[in-house]
């Protein structure tokens, strides 16, 4: 808290300019009018104010706007945004995408801070859904943003926004998140032809059900092993050897290197050894010839 002292003669600030960097903290407090600061916020970022000086400027704005800053001030906070607490930000009503971009730019190159997370949360809640332009902006600044949302939050993403998603945006998503995103992606890309569709849907396939994988296997898609390894185990298990062979195309040879890892390991255990042998990869662990396979899960469902 800065003590209230009178402004020395001739030091009253008539505008926010670079001469203020030579003001001591108490001089800034005494000589800079909060209303002047609010109307000239766009100048603050152009001036190398120190950490301590920014504290004083924030204090002045807090006194002027105890209920929260107006968007006209928020948009021009610049480095002063780094001084804001999540509690400060919860008082704001940010509706403009330009304001969001301006504040994300301040934090660019750094991990998402609690301030940024709160800002994004306020913005998205204010809009009611994660529209394409917002998603475009957020994933440009934070590629992992989408995967930081809960499945419940992801459910508010409209299918049209999926066009903004890049493969790297889904790198850290878990199966529960992909379960929500996959149907949206399927809907978004439904009018594309086979090969183009596969390129777009590929990153989302970790949420695909068995029937969709079976359908893809009929389209000569040549899925790579990295994508196959991210598929849901429960979706892969019912696939036949022939279907997996068609799905992977020339990449089928990669199964050998992955035979001890899920979902390949679990899938092998479900296949007849005879069928596995037709691949000529030396995959071992299938059901020996002459054994009967009982699908207990089906039996449980019926009882």
């Amino acid at each position: 808290e800065v003590e209230k002292t009178a402004c020395p003669s001739g030091k009253k600030a008539r505008e926010i300019d670079e001469s203020l960097i030579f003001y001591k903290k108490w001089e800034l407090e005494a000589c800079v009018d909060a209303a002047l600061l609010a109307t000239q916020m766009d100048r603050v970022n152009a001036i190398p104010f120190t950490y301590e000086q920014l504290d004083v400027l924030k204090h002045k704005l807090d006194e002027l706007y105890p209920q929260g800053y107006p968007e006209s001030v928020i948009q021009h906070l610049g480095y002063l945004f780094l001084k804001m607490s999540p509690e400060d930000i919860r008082k704001w009503n940010v509706t403009s995408l330009e304001t969001l971009k301006a504040l994300l730019e301040v934090n660019k190159g750094h991990e998402m801070s609690p301030q940024v997370a709160t800002l994004i949360d306020r913005f998205v809640k204010g809009r009611g859904q994660l529209d394409k332009d917002t998603l475009d902006t957020l994933t440009a600044f934070y590629p992992g943003y989408l995967c930081s949302l809960s499945p419940e939050e992801l459910s508010s993403v409209p299918p049209s926004s999926i066009w903004a998603v890049r493969p790297q945006d889904l790198d850290t998503c878990d199966p529960r998140q992909l379960d929500v995103l996959y149907p949206k992606a399927r809907l978004a890309f439904q009018n594309m032809n086979g090969s183009e569709y596969f390129v777009k849907i590929q990153s989302f396939l970790g949420g695909a059900p068995t029937e969709d994988l079976k359908a893809l296997s009929q389209q000569n898609v040549s899925m790579d092993l990295a994508t196959f390894m991210k598929l849901r185990t429960d979706a892969v298990l019912p696939l036949t050897v022939a279907e997996v062979q068609k799905l992977l195309g020339p990449h089928v040879e990669g199964l050998k290197a992955e035979e001890r890892h899920r979902p390949v390991r679990d899938w092998i255990l479900r296949q007849r050894q005879d069928d596995l042998d037709t691949l000529g990869l030396g995959l071992q662990g299938g059901i020996p010839n002459g054994y009967l396979v009982l699908d207990l899960s089906m039996q449980e469902a019926l009882s």
Partner: nanobody, 114 residues
Framework: VQLVESGGGLVQPGGSLRLSCAAS????????VAWYRQAPGEQREPVAA???????IYADSVKGRFTISRDNAKNTVYLQMNSLKPEDTAVYYC??????????WGQGTSVTVS
């Protein structure tokens, strides 16, 4: 992001030195920057500043003797110090943008006028 100041040393009164400050990333090309100094037992004070628009300003004590400049291509800020006086003896620091706002500082470079 790191700040590395250099160019300090021992110089006689009336002499000159050119200080350099390099930053990793493209920090200086987009931000307002400043040189500060801290004499023994004193608080750190601004000496010269350049706004993001390129206008410069100097402390009264160094006006006409010091010049701040920057080379965006090299991401470096300079302080040309002429007609040095014993009272210019201090550790000199540069800073700007995000680092300044978050109170991160480099090691500084020591200038002794004697």
């Amino acid at each position: 992001v790191q700040l590395v100041e250099s160019g300090g040393g021992l110089v006689q009164p009336g002499g000159s030195l050119r200080l350099s400050c390099a930053a990793s990333g493209s920090m200086f090309s987009i931000n307002a920057v400043a040189w500060y100094r801290q004499a023994p037992g004193e608080q750190r004070e601004p000496v010269a500043a350049m706004t993001s628009g390129g206008s410069t300003i100097y402390a009264d004590s160094v006006k006409g003797r010091f010049t701040i400049s920057r080379d965006n291509a090299k991401n470096t800020v300079y302080l040309q110090m002429n007609s040095l006086k014993p009272e210019d003896t201090a550790v000199y620091y540069c800073n700007g943008g995000w680092l300044l706002a978050m109170d991160y500082w480099g090691q500084g470079t020591s200038v002794t006028v004697s």
